[in-house]
């Protein structure tokens, strides 16, 4: 009876997500058969989040809208380990929008999910950010410095990275 109600709950939760994500890849978390964490297929997972590399070229605003339609946001990078995971799936000759912008051109950078911007946990290329006109952040590869962030014009189309919390069922 307990197992039956748990299964019903899982199915209803899966139905919720089905409109955005017809297929989920789930793994058992820990030793308890009750706990499953899922990411949409073919998203990748790291710690408690799922990531999707969008290869369509769009402005920052459209990229964020594209992520939100999938129940996600443009990526918020909180640690070096998270960035190291993300870059494994990126192409060196491409740039990808992050969920980081300076809407007023005042050098007041902010994350899309309102995570406080912490100057100590940023990975800007040297000499970046450096332009009041460039109000959106990308991650890209520079041969001298490997992967890092750069500020660019928000309307210039780029690829992007979406991030969402894992789905627990």
């Amino acid at each position: 009876n307990f197992m039956y109600s748990k299964t019903v709950k899982r199915l209803s939760k899966l139905r919720e997500y089905q409109q955005y994500h017809p297929s989920l890849t789930c793994v058992m978390e820990g030793k308890d058969i009750e706990d499953w964490s899922c990411c949409p297929t073919p998203w990748t997972s790291f710690q408690s989040s799922c990531y999707f590399i969008s290869t369509g070229m769009q402005s920052w605003t459209k990229s964020q809208k594209n992520c939100s339609v999938m129940g996600a946001d443009l990526v918020v990078i909180n640690t070096r380990e998270e960035q190291d995971f993300i870059i494994q799936n990126l192409k060196r000759n491409s740039s990808y929008f992050l969920g980081l912008s300076d809407p007023g051109g005042r050098r007041h950078w902010q994350w899309v999910d309102q995570t406080p911007y912490n100057e100590n946990v940023t990975f800007w290329h040297s000499g970046e950010p450096n332009n009041l006109d460039e109000r959106c952040a990308i991650i890209n590869f520079r041969s001298s410095e490997e992967w890092g962030w750069n500020d660019i014009h928000c309307h210039v189309p780029q690829k992007s990275i979406c991030k969402m919390k894992k789905i627990y069922i």
Partner: antibody, heavy 118, light 107 residues
Framework: QVQLQQSGAEVVKPGASVKISCKGS????????MHWVKQAHAKSLEWIGV????????NYNQKFKGKVTMTVDKSSSTAYMELSRLTSDDTAVYYC???????????WGQGTLVTVSS | DIQMTQSPSSLSASVGDRVTITCQAS??????LNWYQQKPDGTVKLLIY???RLHTGVPSRFSGSGSGTDYSLTISNLDQEDIATYYC?????????FGGGTKLEIK
């Protein structure tokens, strides 16, 4: 080549307003914000503020808030700065300057002298 | 606001000399320090940006250095056409601020 052409000298009465212009050419106007800088006679340069030629929003030096209004006309690639409630302290040369990488003003207009006199 | 203290306020040197102008910021400006030249006719030109990078078309006799709060502009092999007033400007924090200027005269 990049050029910023400013409007001519103005003589205006105290309490009046004046609007000076800065026309950009030789580059994509909306890719670069426009700064305005004041220089009173025999004094240093003073940053007034900056307007985004793409978004149209402005950042003003607190000192000039209420005194200055910056606007942009994308169709004519022209930035404007209006000075209101003029006093003799506003007598100065006003420069427009293009925003550049590394928080710099990379090209400057020739300056517009505004003289406030009754 | 960040205060920029420039010295000397005036300077007289001979053609061929090497001159140095200094600029001190009231707090760390992370190398966002730029130098401008204003000719006697009022024309303003960017010389050096981000402490040491030469702007397009600027002669190599101009150079910049520094870090933190202390910066300098050096003109080696002074030329007659270098008669001007020189200004430093910090771009690290709004509002952007300028030094008081250094008027350079040729002996």
């Amino acid at each position: 080549q990049v050029q910023l052409q400013q409007s001519g000298a103005e003589v205006v009465k105290p309490g009046a307003s004046v609007k000076i212009s800065c026309k950009g050419s030789g580059y994509t106007f909306t890719d670069y914000s426009m700064h305005w800088v004041k220089q009173a006679h025999a004094k240093s340069l003073e940053w007034i503020g900056v307007i985004s030629t793409y978004y149209g929003d402005s950042n003003y030096n607190q000192k000039f808030k209420g005194k200055v209004t910056m606007t942009v006309d994308k169709s004519s690639s022209t930035a404007y700065m209006e000075l209101s409630r003029l006093t003799s302290d506003d007598t100065a040369v006003y420069y427009c300057a293009r925003n550049g990488n590394f928080y710099v003003m990379d090209y400057w207009g020739q300056g517009t002298l505004v003289t406030v006199s009754s | 606001d960040i205060q920029m203290t420039q010295s000397p306020s005036s300077l007289s040197a001979s053609v061929g000399d090497r001159v140095t102008i200094t600029c001190q910021a009231s707090q760390d400006i992370s190398n966002y320090l730029n130098w401008y030249q204003q000719k006697p006719d009022g024309t303003v030109k960017l010389l050096i940006y981000y402490t040491s990078r030469l702007h397009t078309g600027v002669p190599s006799r101009f150079s910049g250095s520094g870090s933190g709060t202390d910066y300098s502009l050096t003109i080696s092999n002074l030329d007659q056409e270098d008669i001007a007033t020189y200004y430093c400007q910090q771009g690290n924090t709004l509002p952007w601020t300028f030094g008081g200027g250094t008027k350079l005269e040729i002996k």
